[in-house]
Amino acid sequence: GITIPRNPGCPNSEDKNFPRTVMVNLNIHNRNTNTNPKRSSDYYNRSTSPWNLHRNEDPERYPSVIWEAKCRHLGCINADGNVDYHMNSVPIQQEILVLRREPPHCPNSFRLEKILVSVGCTCVTPIVHHVA
Amino acid sequence: GITIPRNPGCPNSEDKNFPRTVMVNLNIHNRNTNTNPKRSSDYYNRSTSPWNLHRNEDPERYPSVIWEAKCRHLGCINADGNVDYHMNSVPIQQEILVLRREPPHCPNSFRLEKILVSVGCTCVTPIVHHVA
């Protein structure tokens, strides 16, 4: 592969914990400015597997606020607007990175953490187990 | 309430950029160890709005690999297994935090970045615009 030389302007990395402990600038750069405005849509209401959103708050985490989806029904909404229990509403989950204050209550020291969040719901055909 | 003082073991915060630049331990703590193993499931195949997963790789980002969902069809799969174009498969998107090497190619200096990723797809009723 292509060898990219290390930038000579990098901060000193002679720290005994390197590269486990790094410096992170919290001034967030937003890459989403030109994204499709439809992304913030009302899919949660219009889906055949609709969901509600709950504000999950943890002040020792960065970001401290994460919105979590919970499917409204076990089944899916059919063409008549009724819940069809022959299908299943299931959460689509994603593993994301967050920062956890470590040691606790420290304003400028964090540890990376992986958490699982439910982003929305989708309608799936159930797995049917046939009894012999 | 209980008074929790600031932890005396916190790193020094007299940095002029505080709290914009913080220390982060990259030894990831995984909170998902006891989660349902079904989360890494076959929902992408069983959904009425199935999707494929594409590997998005960027060596200047942490994590460098992110899997992105792309809906397989414009419509949704009906009970007969055919695509029904009266319904729409749409991506469920989520804004996530990643670390971007800054300055570029530095192993121990990052900046937080918000990016938008498609996690999966859901089936929605289309918005119909009636022409007068």
């Epitope: 913030s40 959103l53 504000r55 606020v65 304003p107 | 209980i2 709290p19």
Partner: antibody, heavy 119, light 107 residues
Framework: QVQLQQSGAELVRPGASVKLSCKAL????????FHWVKQTPVHGLEWIGV????????AYNQNFRDKATLTADKSSSTAYMELSSLTSEDSGVYYC????????????WGQGTALTVSS | NIVMTQSPSSLSASVGDRVTITCKAS??????VGWFQQKPGKSPKLLIY???NRYTGVPSRFSGSGSGTDFTFTISSLQPEDFATYFC?????????FGQGTKLEIK
């Protein structure tokens, strides 16, 4: 530039309901949380609740759960707060404010809507 | 709920004076504290966020410090336009709560 424009002062009868509005200008409405705050001389500033226009999610202060209902209309970039079963205790100035979810602070505030509940 | 106890409730000072307001949280709120200025008939205006960060366009005479439970807001040299009411507020955890305010008056 960013502006939050709130609806005008309201005088309503006890027992009635009222719907206050807050129109967002100068930024993408769906990108930030909207919070509502009540101010009275007796209780000072009290946080009512939050709505995320991007995903429709809401959360409320327990003290206002049966009083306030938060909604948002993306097409007009407007957030609403409906207050029901009004009593004189609900009189005060109501503010909408934008919350930067990642950064964690309120930056812009509306000019406020004065609500008077009186017979 | 986290209680924010602000003191003093009122304060008389002269132009050029150095003024300090304190806020004590009933439990640790890390650095998640903001300070607001409010003039009669107007909405609150953000001055300081994350305990010590001056918001965009805020003059350097305004400063904040503290972490955990004890926070301080200082105006180094009072200007005529600074006479107003000042509030502290925690956004560490909801319900977000405010101090009762400090009314800064001309001596």
């Amino acid at each position: 530039q960013v502006q939050l424009q709130q609806s005008g002062a309201e005088l309503v009868r006890p027992g009635a309901s009222v719907k206050l509005s807050c129109k967002a200008l100068g930024y993408t409405f769906t990108d930030y949380e909207f919070h509502w705050v009540k101010q009275t001389p007796v209780h000072g500033l009290e946080w009512i609740g939050v709505i995320h226009p991007g995903n429709g999610g809401t959360a409320y202060n327990q003290n206002f759960r049966d009083k306030a209902t938060l909604t948002a209309d993306k097409s007009s970039s407007t957030a609403y707060m409906e207050l029901s079963s009004l009593t004189s205790e609900d009189s005060g100035v109501y503010y909408c404010t934008r919350f930067l979810t990642y950064e964690g602070y309120f930056d812009y505030w509306g000019q406020g809507t004065a609500l008077t509940v009186s017979s | 709920n986290i209680v924010m106890t602000q003191s003093p409730s009122s304060l008389s000072a002269s132009v050029g004076d150095r003024v300090t307001i304190t806020c004590k949280a009933s439990q640790s709120v890390s650095i998640d504290v903001g300070w607001f200025q409010q003039k009669p008939g107007k909405s609150p205006k953000l001055l300081i966020y994350h305990a010590s960060n001056r918001y965009t366009g805020v003059p350097s005479r305004f400063s904040g410090s503290g972490s955990g439970t004890d926070f301080t807001f200082t105006i180094s040299s009072l200007q005529p336009e600074d006479f107003a009411t000042y509030f502290c507020q925690q956004d560490y955890s909801s319900p977000y709560t405010f101090g009762q305010g400090t009314k800064l008056e001309i001596k």
